[in-house]
């Protein structure tokens, strides 16, 4: 089941998935001046069996200059109405990011890929939040959002990270990087 919305944005923070649940789709988007190859995949799909998950399909881009003069509109998957973009940034991934069963790791970049990745997440997906440079977390708890199914509708839990520019000394030892704590997680929230 695809999540209806994007993960919530919060002030002074960015988010990233550390691993992607089976069923996640990643659009094959090309940078300006390039397009998806004819008969190329619309998206990559995280699939797998009980022991191993991987991305099906490969994204391939080719120069738009090689195309004929007839303007083609690139079709998008039906789910395109709801899209989640993540900038291509250095991932905040722990070493064991893909050791989670039923999850794929971040797909490697492909040639002439667009600067933003558009994912279509599935129920149960978790994304992790981190304060942007110049801000710090007010607490050491987990900072994540989970896509859940409630009353037949999907929703993302509210991230509990507060990023503050306060210059006061922190109330706990050690600064930053508290966010991916495994301690009690919001997904324990009950649904109907």
């Amino acid at each position: 089941e695809l999540c209806d919305d994007d993960p919530p944005e919060i002030p002074h923070a960015t988010f990233k998935a550390m691993a992607y649940k089976e069923g996640t789709m990643l659009n094959c988007e090309c940078k300006r001046g390039f397009r998806r190859i004819k008969s190329g995949s619309l998206y990559m799909l995280c699939t797998g069996n009980s022991s191993h998950s991987s991305w099906d399909n490969q994204c391939q881009c080719t120069s738009s200059a090689t195309r004929n003069t007839t303007k083609q509109v690139t079709p998008q998957p039906e789910e395109q109405k709801e899209r989640k973009t993540t900038e291509m940034q250095s991932p905040m991934q722990p070493v064991d990011q893909a050791s989670l069963p039923g999850h794929c790791r971040e797909p490697p970049p492909w040639e002439n890929e667009a600067t933003e990745r558009i994912y279509h997440f599935v129920v149960g997906q978790m994304v992790y939040y981190q304060c942007v440079q110049g801000y710090r977390a007010l607490h050491r708890g987990p900072a994540e959002s989970v896509c859940k199914m409630t009353h037949g509708k999907t929703r993302w839990t509210q991230p509990q990270l507060i990023c503050t520019g306060e210059m006061e000394t922190s109330q706990f030892p050690g600064e930053e990087k508290p966010q991916a704590s495994p301690e009690g997680r919001p997904e324990s929230e009950t649904s109907c």
Epitope: I10, H139, R140, G141, Q160, F172, E183, G184, P186
Partner: antibody, heavy 116, light 107 residues
């Protein structure tokens, strides 16, 4: 399902102390911020402060700093708002709310009346 | 402190009307704004967050828009259940501030 259950109506005299409670049910209480909001009779909403029950970090609105104390007991999934010496101007409805950015769940409110 | 100013304070309307409530911030708050509905004797109920994201379970006749300092809540076709007070709230800083409220009453 997620619920914030607040303690009942209180009638107090000026100068008395009071502690009202808010129990978090149906979710991981220690990992969600809880805020307190005041609504005086016929008036709007005022944010008082917030607590992270996991490690009891608190922040207060400047208007309420030193006037009230926010605390939590994570062993019983409960947040508290307390006064050491009530004034007639503390008469209001007090709501606890799950935050920290927007209030997705609210308690039913605790009415506090302070009168001599 | 960021001040939030709502207008109008009171709004008289009929069932089926399109209703718009405005909220202005004293400084830019990007899209860090939520809207709530409150009925007499009840707790506020979240309608919208991040200026335009509809909370799960809220009817689609409610919509929010705006960014920076000017925001609007629109009810496309007012229903009997919508007569209530409405509040905006900024969360650009963790120290929330609310608008003074708009009461939507029956004309």
């Amino acid at each position: 399902q997620v619920q914030l259950v607040q303690s009942g109506t209180e009638v107090k005299k000026p100068g008395e102390s009071l502690k009202i409670s808010c129990e978090g049910v149906g979710y991981s209480f220690t990992t969600y911020w809880i805020g307190w909001v005041r609504q005086m009779p016929g008036k709007g909403l005022e944010w008082m402060g917030i607590i992270y029950p996991g490690d009891s970090i608190t922040r207060y609105s400047p208007s309420f700093q030193g006037q009230v104390t926010i605390s939590a007991d994570k062993s019983i999934n409960t947040a508290y708002l307390q006064w050491s010496s009530l004034m007639a101007s503390d008469t209001a409805m007090y709501y606890c709310v799950r935050g920290p950015h927007w209030g997705d769940y609210w308690g039913q409110g605790t009415l506090v009346t302070v009168s001599s | 402190d960021i001040q939030m100013t709502q207008s109008p304070s009171t709004l008289s309307a009929s069932v089926g009307d399109r209703v718009t409530i405005t909220c202005r911030a004293s400084q830019s708050i990007s899209t860090w704004l939520a809207w709530y509905q409150q009925k007499p004797g009840k707790a506020p109920k979240l309608l919208i967050y991040k200026a335009s994201s509809l909370e799960s379970g809220v009817p689609s006749r409610f919509s929010g828009s705006g960014s920076g300092t000017e925001f609007t809540l629109t009810i496309s076709s007012l229903q009997p259940d919508d007569f209530a007070a409405y509040y905006c709230q900024q969360y650009s800083s963790y120290s929330w501030t609310f608008g003074q409220g708009t009461k939507v009453e029956i004309k």
